[in-house]
Every structure is written in structure tokens, then in C-alpha cells.
């Protein structure tokens, strides 16, 4: 068997909301996968598996199942959804991301996906993990060739 | 305004327990963590950990996790920290503070000092 | 866990200077710092979060800058009620731990 290869192309689109009494932020953030089949026979794609973190703590989930096949040499753009919630110890952030006073309010979150693929009886995962900056002060839909510029920021060990 | 009224001083023997109270006043106390930091002898700040009363989740310094319980009680708008099996290196003074997130504390109590003595 | 290095740990000025106190992170900690002032008996004030902002209150003359890991506290023309100690704290990831002080003297 050839290759499936998965490539994280970035977020598409980030939709936020706001608690004032609970100081808590909701952003369903839409990812953008290519996933490509090498091989000369279908693969499907079982299902996805992502999350999102924010300083190290997991602040979304979302996993889709019975996705899709892709046929022989194809490549497919899947698009998924998560929704995140930012709130308790991470709350500090609801004022910076509903300040006022400036235009652009990014932060940082670590974008983590797992696809599970099969064929002829045989699974299959391929993980990737991408730093991005999310606007958590405005609903922003992002072009594709912004989704690499998002992609700078690699936290130092 | 913004208020937070800690209960007073303490002295206690070695092993025993003490519990620290923390009554917030002038604000909705769901909306707000209650966080609480070690002082000793006017040196530097300790975070001990924090509460949620909303919720009533903690987040607790791994250091103090055996050492400290926090706790809240929403119909009072007070929060508490129980110190137990105290010990001479528990001897400090104990803040709390409105929380804004992870330990970043914009209205503190005046500080309840604790002294171990046998 | 992260760890807070802040220098210089004592400075003496004088009242109408400007004095910059910093503060490194042991690792990346983005925007996600927090300054205090601490007089002499009393509770920690909060001055600064979120790396430069403004807690509610405080005068403009304290400014806060600095990112990643290299973070700094500047007050402009010191003012007599200005002098005390200065914590730095970050509150990316848990534990949020404190930088050792700087105490800020009159020269």
C-alpha cells in the first residue's frame, strides 16, 4: 500500500459569543483537512478526531464519524468543526478578548487531528498538530492562503 | 465596591487543621474565581490554588494539593481554605483574592495569618 | 512547571525618575503575564495582566510590555506612593507561580 497522506491546510472560519455572567468565551472554530489517497484502490475515511488547546489544557472536542471514501490517486478537502469553550482558569482572557480598544484579538491554539482511514480490512491513523491564531474578538473567516500565514507561531521549549 | 473580609488571625498546634474563611461582598460571586496565596515573612507569593463557586471546580498547585481544601458556599458568597496536618513551614500569612483567571487576582482579603506553635 | 526570574531584585530611585523592572518566563508564556505592587504590610495590588493590560485603576504612569518570555514593568516619573515591592506572575497554564519581588527604594 501507498501513502494516505493528511495535510492540515488551517482554519477556515472562527465564530465567537460571549458570557458576561460566567466570563466565558465560545468559539466553534471550522478546520480545513486535504486528505490524499496514494494508493490505486479506495480508502475510506472511518472518522476524525480533533481537539483544541489553550495553555495546555484541552478546551474542545469534536469527533465526526463515517466520513467519506476516496477513490484511487484522489484527494479529498474535508472541513470540521469545533466547538471550544474558554472559561474558569482561562477566564482572564474574556477581557482581553472583549476589549474594546484594539482591532486584532489572537491567541494561540494548538489545532490537534487524527484521521482513522481503512481499507481491505485494515485501520490506519495519521495525527498532525499545528499552532494557529484565532481572532477571539470577532467573527472571522479566513482565506486559505491566510491559513498559512496563522501558522507562525511555535511556542519555545 | 469590592470586598473581601478574611477571617482573623490563627494559631494552632502542630498536626492540627485550621479553616480560613474569605466572605466577598460587592460583585456577583458566580461570575468570579476565588483564588489564595502563601505569603512567609514578607517574602515572596505562593499560589495555593482556586475555586469556582459557579461550578465549584478547583485548580490546585500540585505543591499544596495535600496540604490545602477549597471550598465555597454561594448562598453566603464565602469561600474557604482548610489548612490540615499543620506544621511549622505552614506558619505564613494567607491571601484570597478575586479571581480574573488562573490566579490573577484584582481585589485581595486583608490576610488571615496562620501560626503553628506547640 | 514555569519559572519566574525577575531582576534587578532591589533598586533604589527617586521620586520623578523613570525605573523598568523585568521579568523571564522559563518558557514560552505569550501575552500571559500579571504585575503587582506589595507595600510594606499590605496586599498585593494588581497593576498590569494580559502583558500590558491595565488593571482597573491604575494610573497611567505604569505600563507593562513584553511577550514571549521576556516581559517588562516601566513606571514613568516614580511618585512617593510608588515605592514597595513588584511581583511578576504568569497565568499561561497551571501552576501560576510568581516571580521572587523586586523592592523598589527611595534613593
Known amino acids: 500500500p501507498r501513502s494516505i497522506e493528511v495535510k492540515y491546510i488551517g482554519v477556515k472560519s472562527a465564530y465567537v459569543s460571549y458570557d458576561a455572567e460566567k466570563r466565558t468565551i465560545y468559539l466553534n472554530i471550522t478546520n480545513t483537512l486535504n486528505i490524499t489517497n496514494n494508493n490505486y484502490y479506495s480508502v475510506e475515511v472511518e472518522n476524525i478526531t480533533a481537539q483544541v488547546q489553550f495553555s495546555k489544557t484541552v478546551i474542545g472536542k469534536a469527533r465526526l464519524n463515517n466520513i467519506t471514501n476516496i477513490g484511487p490517486l484522489d484527494m479529498k478537502q474535508i472541513d470540521y468543526t469545533v466547538p471550544t469553550v474558554i472559561a474558569e482558569e482561562m477566564s482572564y482572557m474574556y477581557d482581553f478578548c472583549t476589549l474594546l480598544s484594539i482591532k486584532v484579538h489572537n491567541i494561540v491554539l494548538m489545532m490537534q487531528v487524527t484521521v482513522t482511514t481503512a481499507y481491505f480490512g485494515h485501520s490506519e491513523q495519521i495525527s498532525q498538530e499545528r499552532y494557529q491564531y484565532v481572532d477571539c474578538g470577532r467573527n472571522t473567516t479566513y482565506q486559505l492562503a491566510q491559513s498559512e500565514y496563522l501558522n507562525v507561531l511555535q511556542p519555545q521549549q | 465596591q469590592v470586598q473581601l473580609q478574611q477571617s482573623g488571625t490563627e494559631l494552632a498546634r502542630p498536626g492540627a487543621s485550621v479553616k480560613v474563611s474569605c466572605k466577598a461582598s460587592g460583585y456577583i460571586f458566580t461570575t468570579y474565581g476565588i483564588t489564595w496565596v502563601k505569603q512567609r515573612g514578607g517574602q515572596g507569593l505562593e499560589w495555593i490554588g482556586e475555586i469556582y463557586p459557579r461550578s465549584d471546580n478547583t485548580y490546585y498547585n500540585e505543591k499544596f494539593k495535600d496540604k490545602a481544601t477549597l471550598t465555597a458556599d454561594k448562598s453566603s458568597s464565602t469561600a474557604y481554605m482548610e489548612l490540615r496536618s499543620l506544621t511549622s513551614e505552614d506558619s505564613a500569612v494567607y491571601f484570597c483574592a478575586r479571581s480574573k483567571g488562573s490566579g490573577t487576582g484584582d481585589y485581595w482579603g486583608q490576610g488571615t495569618t496562620v501560626t503553628v506553635s506547640s | 512547571d514555569i519559572q519566574m526570574t525577575q531582576s534587578p531584585a532591589s533598586l533604589s530611585a527617586s521620586v520623578g525618575e523613570t525605573v523598568t523592572i523585568t521579568c523571564r518566563a522559563s518558557e514560552n508564556i505569550y501575552i500571559y503575564l500579571a504585575w503587582y505592587q506589595q507595600k510594606q504590610g499590605k496586599t498585593p495590588q494588581l497593576l498590569v495582566y494580559?502583558?500590558?493590560m491595565l488593571a482597573e485603576n491604575v494610573p497611567s504612569r505604569f505600563s507593562g510590555s513584553g511577550s514571549g518570555t521576556q516581559f517588562s514593568l516601566k513606571i514613568n516619573s516614580l511618585q512617593p506612593e510608588d515605592f514597595g515591592s513588584y511581583y511578576c506572575?504568569?497565568?499561561?497554564?497551571?501552576?501560576?507561580?510568581f516571580g521572587a519581588g523586586t523592592k523598589l527604594e527611595l534613593k
Open positions: 494580559n502583558g500590558k
Open positions: 506572575q504568569h497565568h499561561y497554564g497551571s501552576p501560576p507561580a
